[in-house]
């Protein structure tokens, strides 16, 4: 019905306005109604005036160009004619009156379907229901993949691709690791994974100053060491270093008053040549104070050595020894002075002997026959040494004596001459310059090492070796080594260190193997004005040790892996040092500073003297400990 | 005996030289400096000039440089002093003196102590026209 | 060249007395001061060296104290024999140099 409609419609508009020229009221005849009516007529006008005023030719030229009046006049009430609707989007036209409505293909909107939907962005439908990619296409979308994902057959959700099996060798030496969409070649830790090589490579942190002081790369790692030789340990960060502080302060006053005998380990302390009148003699006061029992005092010679007077100590007593053209001769007497308080010594030639007081008292008388000195030039010509002696006297004595002694002396008056120019040169060398109060003991101030040949070797025992060592330690500062055991590889098959525990104001005692600790014993009381003492016994099976708290053998998986690393080095050649590390590598042990403090060690059951060491260090004290600083009142 | 004894003294014009020698016994030359030391009439000392051991050093009060100079001859344990271009104030008793190094330390470093123990009686030098 | 000064440049005093010479040096000369005596018509004599020892024979009552640029002699009780000039004289360093000399007379 609807047709039959529109074509009576076509067949009055033809006969109306085609065949003949309509005006408004007439073409409102043919539609019958205004809105159509409305629509036509303006573009019903268009056409005449293309078709009558001779436009046809430019008309042709538009888009909605028509042949002939007809069809142009024919085409306006056709909404859908020409085309509104968006060619790509729409699916249909329907015209309506004086209006249109154009149909849309899926995926597509708007009045004419110009509009593509977004299904991508569709909130009913979040990524378009894709799992990973939505792709927006006009009309349409599809959904994709990441790199490292297929799609499945739902052509919506995606599959990760594991590269590892698909490729095995992809990552060369380096450990595939497949991850979601990718794969990762992995390295342990400290290394880099190096794309060229296909290989992890060491990372070189200390190329990357990761330490403050010093660095030690190694495969997969890096340790940082601080210099322990100058005072620093490493701080509890592991990278930065901090001073090693003094943990019980000394008094470490001294005065120059008092001459230090100890000042040097090998050699004389003070020389001292006269040329005086030959109506002098020799004669030597004094005061003296020291804890050692055997060393030099002072030796005078004659200017040709063809006399000498040695005035010394052994076993605590003063004893002189005497060459000279009439006589040879050695005595000791008095009583034992080497207890630590100062003693007035004198020692005078007169005309027929040679007089020794202490504290004024007359111990020894020497006969001579002549004078001890032959004077030269009218002159008496004497050499005097502190401490010590010319070398190709030590052949020369009545009686070997070790030279060293760890004393001091004040109030000298030699030749009766004073002190006078020697006490200016002293008291511009610190270094000679006596502490003012001393203890019993020995002195390590932190800043070398003392060094002796033990042999180890126990014929008797099964065991082969042992190293049992006992020590009585009232340390200064937390951290040092107190005794190492050096091959001549440059390693340290065996040390025992101090370091300051991570609980505050307590110290551990280290047990190392090379740079492996073995046994750490944790937060004692060490840096007191009280002495502590410590034993530990050591062979190829077994590590025992005592402590103020505990006595116990130590065993544990790992200890007799390393005791057999320090039994081959036993086996071989090992050098002690006590108080700290000669020139090995930073690496070779746990801990590298000098132990600071006073120390006694005995080693398998004898008392190491310091003075008899192979070398030391000249600040180490072999017979004398700094007291305890006391706080007074106004300090 | 330890003696020195100075001779060669004189009167002499300005412009004119002299030569003192000085004799040493009871000692070996060879083993000490020697100094010379003058003392012009109602005057104080004033040191002239000394010579090493070996003779490789020698020094000189700044008034008598380029004038006088001090030789030895340990051979003969004689010590001299030429004295050229002399002048009125060069007149004074000269004394020969030993310097005996009295106090000699060795302490990280040498140091000696000097002092003038043996001495003449002076030799007089008078310069006039 | 170091200046070395003497005061007083005399003195007079009693046998018995206490007399005390002091000596300046024009920079530090360490403890390199020597003292000597001269008595009319003789040579001079060496009493101290190095400040404060005493040259051998030299009676114990002659003392010397000082280092740096200041320097004393004493005598502790002034006998007969100890009337003349003395004269300190410095050794540190060429030319050796003498103060002007102190006379110490009879009062």
């Known amino acids: 019905a609807n047709s039959l409609l529109e074509e009576t419609k076509q067949g009055n508009l033809e006969r109306e306005c085609i065949e003949e020229l309509c005006n408004k009221e007439e073409a409102r005849e043919v539609f019958e109604n205004d809105p159509e009516t409305d629509y036509f007529y303006p573009k019903y006008l268009v056409c005449l005036r293309s078709f009558q005023t001779g436009l046809f030719t430019a008309a042709r030229q538009s888009t909605n160009a028509y042949p002939d009046l007809r069809s142009c006049v024919n085409a306006i009430p056709d909404q859908c004619s020409p085309l509104p609707c968006n060619e790509d989007g729409y699916m249909s036209c329907k015209d309506g009156k004086a209006s249109f409505t154009c149909t849309c293909k899926p995926g597509w909107q708007g009045e004419k379907c110009e509009f593509d939907i977004n299904e991508c962005k569709d909130p009913s439908n979040i990524n378009g229901g894709c799992s990973q990619i939505c792709d927006n296409t006009p009309g349409s979308y599809h959904c994709s993949c990441k790199n490292g994902f297929v799609m499945l057959s739902n052509k919506k959700d995606c599959k990760d691709v594991d590269e590892c099996s698909l490729k095995p060798s992809i990552c060369g030496t380096a450990v595939c690791k497949n991850i979601p969409g990718d794969f990762e070649c992995e390295c342990p830790e400290g290394y880099r994974y190096n794309l060229k090589s296909k290989s992890c490579e060491d990372i070189d942190e200390c190329s990357e100053n990761m330490c403050a002081q010093l660095c030690v790369n190694y495969p997969g790692g890096y340790t940082c060491y601080c210099d322990g030789k100058k005072g620093f340990k490493l701080a509890q960060d592991q990278k930065s270093c901090e001073v090693v502080s003094v943990c019980l302060p000394l008094n470490l006053d001294t005065k120059y008053e008092l001459l230090y005998l100890a000042e040097q380990f090998a050699g004389v302390v003070l020389y001292l040549k006269f040329r005086l009148p030959e109506i002098s003699r020799f004669s030597a006061e004094f005061d003296f104070r020291t804890y050692d029992s055997e060393g030099v005092i002072l030796y005078a010679e004659s200017i040709d050595h063809s006399a000498w007077l040695l005035i010394a100590l052994r076993g605590g007593k003063i004893e002189v020894q005497l060459k000279n053209e009439h006589t040879s001769k050695i005595t000791t007497g008095g009583d034992v002075i080497n207890n630590g308080l100062w003693n007035m010594v004198s020692v005078e030639e007169l005309e027929h002997s040679i007089s020794i007081k202490i504290a004024k008292e007359a111990v020894m008388d020497i006969n001579k026959p002549g004078p001890l000195f032959k004077p030269e030039n009218g002159l008496l010509e004497t050499k005097v040494y502190f401490a010590g002696f010319p070398r190709k006297v030590e052949s020369e004595l009545i009686k070997p004596i070790n030279p060293r002694l760890d004393g001091c002396i004040r109030s000298w008056n030699l030749m009766k001459q004073g002190a006078s120019g020697i006490k200016e040169i002293i008291q511009e060398k610190q270094n000679k310059h006596c502490l003012v109060t001393v203890e019993k003991g020995s002195y390590y101030p932190g800043s070398g090492i003392a060094q002796f040949h033990i042999d180890y070797n126990n014929v008797s025992s099964a065991e082969g070796w042992h190293v049992n060592v006992t020590l009585n330690i009232r340390p200064s500062t937390g951290t040092g080594v107190m005794l190492a055991l050096v091959s001549g590889n440059n390693t340290v098959p065996f040390a025992v260190s101090l370091v300051d525990s991570t609980s505050e104001k307590s110290q551990d005692i280290l047990l190392s193997v090379e740079n492996t600790v073995i046994y750490r014993i944790q937060a004692l009381s060490l840096c007191s004005d009280q002495q502590s003492h410590l034993e530990f016994r050591v062979n190829r099976n077994n590590l025992e040790l005592s402590t103020p708290l505990k006595i116990e053998t130590i065993s544990h998986e790992d200890l007799q892996r390393q005791l057999a690393v320090l039994d081959k080095a036993m086996k071989a050649k090992v050098a002690t040092y006590l108080g700290g590390l000669p020139d090995v590598p930073f690496s070779a042990t746990p801990v590298n500073a000098f132990y600071n403090g006073c120390m006694e060690v005995n080693i398998n059951g004898v008392q190491l003297d310091l003075d008899e060491a192979i070398s030391k260090h000249n600040d180490i004290r072999a017979h004398s400990c700094p007291s305890v600083w006391k706080k007074t009142k106004n300090s | 005996e330890v003696q020195v004894v100075e001779s060669g003294g004189g009167l002499v014009q300005p412009g004119g030289s002299l030569r003192l020698s000085c004799a040493a016994s009871g000692f070996t030359l060879n083993s000490f400096w020697m100094s010379w030391v003058r003392q012009a009439p109602g005057k104080g000392l004033e040191w002239v000039a000394n010579?090493?051991?070996?003779?490789?050093?020698?020094y000189y009060v700044d008034s008598v440089k380029g004038r006088f100079t001090i030789s030895r001859d340990n051979a003969k344990n004689s010590l001299y002093l030429q004295m050229n271009g002399l002048r009125a104030e060069d007149t004074a008793l000269y004394y020969c003196a030993r310097e005996t190094d009295i106090l000699t330390a060795y302490y990280s470093d040498y140091y000696s102590y000097y002092g003038m123990d043996v001495w003449g009686q002076g030799t007089t030098v008078t310069v006039s026209a | 060249d170091i200046q070395m000064t003497q005061s007083p440049s005399s003195l007079s005093a009693s046998v018995r007395d206490r007399v005390t010479i002091n000596c300046r040096a024009s920079q530090s000369i360490r403890s390199y001061l020597n003292w000597y005596q001269q008595k009319p018509g003789k040579a001079p004599k060496l009493l101290i060296y190095?400040?404060?020892s005493l040259q051998g024979g030299v009676p114990s009552r002659f003392s010397g104290s000082g280092s740096g640029t200041d320097f004393t002699l004493t005598i502790s009780s002034l006998q007969p024999e100890d009337f003349a000039t003395y004269y300190c004289?410095?050794?540190?360093?060429?030319?050796?140099?003498f103060g002007q000399g102190t006379k110490v007379e009879i009062k």
């Open positions: 190095a400040a404060s």
């Open positions: 004289q410095q050794s540190y360093s060429t030319p050796r140099t």
């Open positions: 010579i090493k051991e070996d003779g490789s050093e020698k």
